[in-house]
Every structure is written in structure tokens, then in C-alpha cells.
Interface confidence: low
């Protein structure tokens, strides 16, 4: 049994370019904690993946308002260790995932919120008994550095904590066959309690006569590889080629039990009996209690009185996830209508709406005429949240109130030349052209192109534009 | 081997209570959640709700207002109460392990057949 | 709550065909938090995948669980004659635990 132990050193932007903006402000106040998971190995496991060797999570830290205009510096801590304990030995090696959490503590309906602002992971070797190691990991510009070690609890002692120490009996020397325990020289080891030729390397024992192996070991003595494992089984006949015992259909064949689990084969197939921490059909998951506090933004957490049970939170209306720590992203069901902006302020769904609508939904079309005038003889005309003009001819603007010039947009093609006239305008063709804008050339032999000419106009006279 | 056994009414007057037990045998009944779950005549399955061995229920909202599971670790059982029964509640009540680790159903009973009639 | 829908209702196939059933929740589901069931004629459910893919004690693996967020999907590799059945997907991520209406697996 032993403690592994993490003390964060400080948790601010990278070095390089594109630092984070701090994450907390004058008027949204924070603060900050971590979570870190352990797992036994080296193997790459998701994070949602059970923290087999234990979690833990910091205290909060203090708040933190972050100061106008100035870069986000290093945040302010929680004090003191993060520290898992772990009951059988230490595996020396495991995963890890550090989460910096961020406690918002703004005006929040309903107690504060939490958002993860980075999370990084890694795989290391680590003796119990060893120095400090330290490390700095980063995740998106954010910069984490940490340092960690395990240490045995006493009486346990050695690199995988799997050596027990006793005080002296004797003042002057130890036992026969019994070493001092370095560096407490005023202790010995132990007497040999494990079950005879259980192996000191990869065997240990919590009680006399056991013979528990380490990772990657197996066998009654744990001297066996697992890889080799299959030598062991007394079912099956024999391989001529290996010696070996090839082995039948056993269901316990390889211990399917994770964390220390004992296998007991039923009618059906196996069970577990997993050792206290830990459950699962194979003992996979690990015992954080509702003790933790593992359930965010208020979120009830019910059972998980010790860490043989497990918990699960209820989550309150706009969080969800096994931890609630996940907000419901509400506007993502488009409650705002006509085009409205959706707002989740936590608390509440807001909709910032588009002229001419209004109500909590953006459900009311506002009458956009509504003491609306248009000069000069337009005409209104509803339509997309704001109000239009139809203008008489001769006039234009918003509220038809500028007297239109209809030459601006040069409508006479072909070097036509524009007339503005009281009803519109007037194109006056050149030579060769005809037509409403001066559009259709005039063919060598006199007959225009398309359409023909209306009867009482020759072709080059101007036309006036209806 | 863990192993669970109904025992209960299969007919119920309407305005009445059902009330089923179930045992647990080959295990305790500490540490894990026990639960209830009823399956109408050609239905699908609807969770009723559970009890954790601590005493802590959790009960469906649409049922909430008329369930009781209670629970009695000295004889291994833990209990249903479904108040004012209509025919709507005639279905086949199962009991069930919810395995804390997975918090999936990973031991059921037979199941019983109540029916609700005068 | 939690809806669960499953698709098909019905799926006719032959003894040796592969099975592809369809399980989607109205909200995402955590973590994988996610059961399939099969059940029989006149027998109780039997836990076949927890966790969206970890296969429970005693089942083959011919069936496999797999997916995340709010779609998963439940595959049995090779139809043997006892898996037709009805298979039912179950969330435990929210309270109230909520099943699907069922997908019925018929003989063609």
C-alpha cells in the first residue's frame, strides 16, 4: 500500500506565440482545481476509461480576477498535494490525465459552473520510494508543470511497496536472515510471510501464506510470464512440441479480474470478487465516492457511500454527462425564431432579436408599416423584419422622399443618350440603334433586328421609356 | 451465483396496492443497486426504479408519485409497493441486480405477472 | 428523460448473416454508458454489452457493441440459430434509466 503523490507548480500559457486569454474576468471571477487519474501500465487509454489506480481531486484555489488588458499570467493554485492512494502494490509503471478545471463564480442561478480548460496525459515509469520527478506537459497554449512520486505507506516498503518493515526487536541487530530497512536503519524487514517460493521480484503478500503477482506475472508462485501462461494449465492434453499443457476452455484461464481481482469460475462462465476500491464485471472501474464530490454543477449525487459502491449523478436541468459536467448546449435546438441570436447564459436562454420581431422566442412579427409613411405617394410593404417603400415613379430612398434621377444608372446603351422626363426617361439612339435603352442594332437593308420598329417611329428616334 | 426470486400476487383489483418481494440468494445484497422493472403484455421494457443497499432510492418520474422500494438486508430482500394499480399497470414485474460498476442489469429474475383486474 | 430509438423494428435474416442493429439517443450519452439486452419468449432480459462495447460474462463474441455520443450500434458477426430474439439498448448516463422500443431479429 502506498500514496502516489502530485504537486502542481504552476499552470499558465506556453511559451510561443497565440497565449490564451486568462480564463477568468472582472465580471466573471474564477478559480481553479485539478483532477488526476491513474492507471495501471503503459497502455494508451482513453480518458473516459476507469481510473484503475485511483483519482483524486484538489482543493479549490483562490479567486482570481484577471486584470484589464494585461496577458493571462500563471493562475493562481490550490495548496497542498493531490494525493491518491493505492492499496495493492505499485504497478511502476502507469498512465496519467491531469484536468485543470474552471470554477466559475460569476452570477450563476444554482451554485457555480465548471468547464475543463486543458488536459494532458502522458506514460511514465516511476519506482515507489524514489525522488521527486518533474515534468511540464502542455495542452493547446496552455503550460502544466508538476512534479510527482509514490511513496510507500509503512509498514510496506520497496520499489512496488510489496516489502514490509517492522521495528526493531532488538536494539543492536536484526533477526537472522532479516536486513535493516534502508534507509530507516532502526527497522528490519519483515519475516517472510508470503507463501513459500513466492517470488520477491514479481510476488508479494498482503497476508501469510499468499502469493499475489504483479503485473504481467502469473502462475502459483508468480514466476510464470503471462505471455507463457498457457504452461500452467492442468487441463488439456499435452503438446508434443512444448511440453507444455495446452489448455482447455477455462474461464478463469488469465485471470479476466483486473486490479487484484480473484476469479471464481460459476455454471454460467466467472465472477469477480474484487478487492475493496474497485467493481465492475472485472473489477474495471475504481471507487470514487460521492465523499469526492464527483458530481458538478450541482448535480445530487446518490449511492457511492464507500468505495465498494459506486455513484451516479442526477444532473439539474442544463447539465448532463455521468459527472454533469457537460452543459447542455440549448441553443443548438435553434430555440430562437426568425432568425434570432440564441444566448445561453447558464441560467437561462436568452434570444437577441432581429428588427422587426420580439418576444422571448422571437416569435412576434412586429407590424413593420406600423406609423411607417412613405412620401410622395409610395407605398409600404411589410416584409423580413423591416419596413419598405414602393415608390412612385420619379422618386426613391427609403421613405421615397429624394426625387430620383433616372439617368444615373446610364440605362441608354450603344452611347444612347438619357433624358430625364417627367414619367422616366428617354433615350435619344445613335445612329444604327434603336429600342427602348437603344438595345437592338439596326440592320444595313433597314430592317431592324428583333422586334420591329412600332409603326410612327423610325429607326434613330428617341424613345420614350414607360 | 448470484440468483433472484419473486414471489408476489399475479392479480390485483384496480385502487389496490401490488406489492412484490424479491430475494437474493448466492450473494449479498450489500454493494450493489437492486431494481425493478415491469414489461407490459408485448411491450418494451420500462425501469421502475432502484434502491442502493445504503437505503438511497431513485424512482422514474412517471411513476414516482406511486412506487416504494424498500429494502431488508437481514433477510436479503428488498421490496416493490405500486399504489392505486389500473389495468395499465398489468405487465410482468422483473427484479434485477444493476451491477455498480457497469450500472447495467446484470442479473434478472423470471419474472412475475400481475395483473390488474376486478 | 432520455428517448431511445431503435432500427429497425424488424430484421429478417438467415442463420450465418450478419446483424446490424441501430440504437439513437435524443441526447448524447457519456461516456459510452450504453446496454444492449436479448431477450426471448417467456424469458427474462440478458445483459449482452455495458459500456457501448465491453461484452458482459458469457457472451460470444460473435456479438460486439459499438459507438458513442448518440448513435451506437449492436453487430452480431454470424447469426446462430439461438440469437433470434428481440435486443433492447439501454442508457444509464440520466436518470431515468430508459430502454429503446426493441428490435425484433426473425428468421427469414
Known amino acids: 500500500a502506498g500514496v502516489f503523490e502530485l504537486q502542481i507548480h504552476s499552470f499558465g500559457p506556453g511559451p510561443g506565440p497565440g497565449a490564451p486569454r486568462s480564463p477568468c474576468s472582472a465580471r466573471l471571477p474564477c478559480r481553479l482545481f485539478f483532477r488526476v487519474c491513474l492507471k495501471p501500465g503503459l497502455s494508451e487509454e482513453a480518458a473516459e476509461s476507469p481510473c484503475a489506480l485511483g483519482a483524486a481531486l484538489s482543493a479549490r484555489g483562490p479567486v482570481y480576477t484577471e486584470q484589464p488588458g494585461a496577458p493571462a499570467p500563471d493562475l493562481p493554485l490550490p495548496d497542498g498535494l493531490l494525493q491518491v492512494p493505492f492499496r495493492d502494490a505499485w504497478p511502476g509503471t502507469f498512465s496519467f490525465i491531469i484536468e485543470t478545471w474552471r470554477e466559475e463564480l460569476g452570477d450563476q442561478i444554482g451554485g457555480p459552473a465548471w468547464s475543463l480548460l486543458a488536459r494532458v496525459a502522458g506514460r511514465r515509469r516511476l519506482a515507489a520510494g524514489g525522488p521527486w520527478a518533474r515534468d511540464i506537459q502542455r495542452a493547446g497554449a496552455w503550460e502544466l508543470r508538476f512534479s510527482y512520486r509514490a511513496r510507500c505507506e509503512p509498514p510496506a516498503v520497496g520499489t512496488a511497496c510489496t516489502r514490509l518493515c517492522r521495528p526493531r526487536s532488538a536494539p543492536s541487530r536484526c533477526g537472522p536472515g532479516l536486513r535493516p530497512c534502508a534507509p530507516l536503519e532502526d527497522e528490519c524487514e519483515a519475516p517472510l510471510v508470503c507463501r513459500a517460493g513466492c517470488s520477491p521480484e514479481h510476488g508479494f503478500c498482503e497476508q501469510p501464506g499468499e502469493c499475489r503477482c504483479l503485473e504481467g506475472w502469473t502462475g502459483p508462485l508468480c514466476t510464470v510470464p503471462v505471455s507463457t501462461s498457457s504452461c500452467l494449465s492442468p487441463r488439456g492434453p499435452s503438446s508434443a512440441t512444448t511440453g507444455c499443457l495446452v489448455p482447455g476452455p477455462g474461464p478463469c484461464d488469465g485471470n479476466p479480474c483486473a486490479n487484484g481481482g480473484s476469479c471464481s469460475e460459476t455454471p454460467r462462465s466467472f465472477e469477480c470478487t474484487c478487492p475493496r476500491g474497485f467493481y465492475g464485471l472485472r473489477c474495471e472501474v475504481s471507487g470514487v465516492t460521492c465523499a469526492d464530490g464527483p458530481c458538478f454543477n450541482g448535480g445530487l449525487c446518490v449511492g457511492g457511500a464507500d468505495p465498494d459502491s459506486a455513484y451516479i449523478c442526477h444532473c439539474p436541468p442544463g447539465f448532463q454527462g455521468s459527472n454533469c459536467e457537460k452543459r447542455v448546449d440549448r441553443c443548438s435546438l435553434q430555440p430562437c425564431r426568425n432568425g434570432g441570436l440564441c444566448l445561453d447564459l447558464g441560467h437561462a436562454l436568452r434570444c437577441r432579436c432581429r428588427a422587426g420581431f420580439a418576444g422571448p422566442r422571437c416569435e412576434h412579427d412586429l407590424d413593420d408599416c406600423a406609423g411607417r409613411a412613405c412620401a410622395n405617394g409610395g407605398t409600404c410593404v411589410e416584409g423580413g423584419g423591416a419596413h419598405r417603400c414602393s415608390c412612385a415613379l420619379g422618386f426613391g430612398g427609403r421613405d421615397c422622399r429624394e426625387r430620383a434621377d433616372p439617368c444615373a444608372a446610364r440605362p441608354c446603351a450603344h452611347g444612347g443618350r438619357c433624358y430625364a422626363h417627367f414619367s422616366g426617361l428617354v433615350c435619344a439612339c445613335a445612329p444604327g440603334y434603336m429600342g427602348a435603352r437603344c438595345e437592338f442594332p439596326v440592320h444595313p437593308d433597314g430592317a431592324s433586328a428583333l422586334p420591329a420598329a412600332p409603326p410612327g417611329l423610325r429607326p434613330g428616334d428617341p424613345q420614350r421609356y414607360l | 451465483q448470484v440468483q433472484l426470486q419473486e414471489s408476489g400476487p399475479g392479480l390485483v383489483k384496480p385502487s389496490q396496492t401490488l406489492s412484490l418481494t424479491c430475494t437474493v440468494s448466492?450473494?449479498?445484497?450489500?454493494?450493489y443497486y437492486w431494481s425493478w422493472i415491469r414489461q407490459p403484455p408485448g411491450k418494451g421494457l420500462e425501469w421502475i426504479g432502484y434502491i442502493f443497499y445504503n437505503g438511497i432510492t431513485n424512482y422514474n418520474p412517471s411513476l414516482k408519485s406511486r412506487v416504494t422500494i424498500s429494502l431488508d438486508t437481514s433477510k436479503n430482500q428488498f421490496s416493490l409497493k405500486l399504489s392505486s394499480v389500473t389495468a395499465a399497470d398489468t405487465a410482468k414485474y422483473y427484479c434485477a441486480r444493476i451491477h455498480s460498476g457497469s450500472f447495467s442489469f446484470d442479473y434478472w429474475d423470471q419474472g412475475t405477472l400481475v395483473t390488474v383486474s376486478s | 428523460e432520455i428517448v431511445m430509438t431503435q432500427s429497425p423494428g424488424t430484421l429478417s435474416l438467415s442463420p450465418g448473416e450478419r446483424a446490424t442493429l441501430s440504437c439513437r439517443a435524443s441526447q448524447s450519452v457519456s461516456r459510452g454508458y450504453l446496454a444492449w439486452y436479448q431477450q426471448k419468449p417467456g424469458q427474462a432480459p440478458r445483459l449482452l454489452i455495458y459500456?457501448?462495447?465491453s461484452r458482459a460474462t458469457d457472451i460470444p463474441d460473435r456479438f460486439s457493441g459499438s459507438g458513442s455520443g448518440t448513435d451506437f450500434t449492436l453487430t452480431i458477426s454470424r447469426l446462430e440459430p439461438e440469437d433470434f430474439a428481440v435486443y433492447y439498448c439501454?442508457?444509464?448516463?440520466?436518470?431515468?434509466?430508459?430502454f429503446g422500443q426493441g428490435t425484433k431479429v426473425e428468421i427469414k
Open positions: 439501454q442508457q444509464y448516463d440520466t436518470s431515468p434509466i430508459t
Open positions: 448466492g450473494g449479498s445484497i450489500s454493494s
Open positions: 459500456g457501448a462495447s
